[in-house]
Amino acid sequence: VLEVYYTSLRCRCVQESSVFIPRRFIDRIQILPRGNGCPRKEIIVWKKNKSIVCVDPQAEWIQRMMEVLRKRSSSTLPVPVFKRKIP
């Protein structure tokens, strides 16, 4: 089970997808910044159907979506965005 604030000295994503997922089908998004043993940024998406997918951070759609979500105040996000806590 993936944990929102889990930290490890390795990458979490084995495979990444760039296939678009509409916001309405996303439950939450976790952003894992580069570092802590993983050389790349990772984005993990929890979907409404309970499945989980790693999304390519370079995918245009996720970049646009993250920008839209950043513009909204955290209290009104329909899709919570979590970032890994770096100790």
């Epitope: 296939v19 678009f20 997922i21 509409p22 916001r23 979506m65 839209v68 329909p78």
Partner: antibody, heavy 121, light 106 residues
Framework: EVQLVESGGGLVQPGGSLRLSCAAS????????MAWVRQAPGKGLEWVAS????????YYRDSVKGRFTISRDNAKNSLYLQMNSLRAEDTAVYYC??????????????WGQGTLVTVSS | DIQMTQSPSSLSASVGDRVTITCKAS??????LTWYQQKPGKAPKRLIY???ILQTGIPSRFSGSGSGTEYTLTISSLQPEDFATYFC????????FGQGTKLEIK
């Protein structure tokens, strides 16, 4: 011109099964999420299920989970809804709808004319 | 799940009247709202998406507004062809339709 044509509706007994089909034309079918929406006689609209581009991702309303299966065949430009363990409350006109997306937002821009499913003994 | 409460459920009006229909969401839907018109025996027709963007080919007498949890559809001057049932749809989290507003001739 975008066209969606549903078929497969009919009268079925409670507990029975039915498979609805939706034939799509006038657009690149594989480029769109698709959905089924239903409307009980004289009632409002109710989203039933959605499917992503290649059929690998599906979503259902709680009341049909485990009973209904949405699928698609991109080679045939067709969308399907397999309905099992049907109940009286599933009686409705079932619409096939195209889900149009821009930045993950606006949706359901094109609809078929619907097919009537009646569950009764 | 997000609930949508649409009001009124029915409305009598005359040609030329200004009419407003409201949809209230149980939580913030961030303007991710669509309005549909439906006539008996027909499929729903999209009028407005993203709260206030008019669908191509829809007359400018239709307009939408709102934010947060409250949204409105306004018909500035009713025409005979506007008598129908109107539904709102939130697409912020899965989908939920409003119960519908039947617009009848007074």
């Amino acid at each position: 011109e975008v066209q969606l044509v549903e078929s497969g509706g009919g009268l079925v007994q409670p507990g029975g099964s039915l498979r609805l089909s939706c034939a799509a034309s006038g657009f690149t079918f594989s480029d769109y999420y698709m959905a089924w929406v239903r409307q009980a006689p004289g009632k409002g609209l109710e989203w039933v299920a959605s499917i992503n581009y290649d059929g690998g991702d599906t979503y259902y309303r709680d009341s049909v989970k485990g009973r209904f299966t949405i699928s698609r065949d991109n080679a045939k430009n067709s969308l399907y809804l397999q309905m099992n363990s049907l109940r009286a409350e599933d009686t409705a006109v079932y619409y096939c709808a195209r889900e149009e997306d821009y930045d993950g937002s606006y949706v359901m821009d094109a609809w078929g004319q619907g097919t009537l499913v009646t569950v009764s003994s | 799940d997000i609930q949508m409460t649409q009001s009124p459920s029915s409305l009598s009006a005359s040609v030329g009247d200004r009419v407003t229909i409201t949809c209230k969401a149980s939580q913030n839907i961030n303007k991710e709202l669509t309005w549909y018109q439906q006539k008996p025996g027909k499929a729903p027709k999209r009028l407005i998406y993203n709260t206030n963007i008019l669908q191509t080919g829809i007359p400018s007498r239709f307009s939408g507004s709102g934010s947060g949890t409250e949204y409105t559809l306004t018909i500035s001057s009713l025409q005979p062809e506007d008598f129908a049932t109107y539904f709102c749809l939130q697409q912020s989290s899965l989908y939920t339709f409003g119960q519908g507003t039947k617009l009848e001739i007074k």
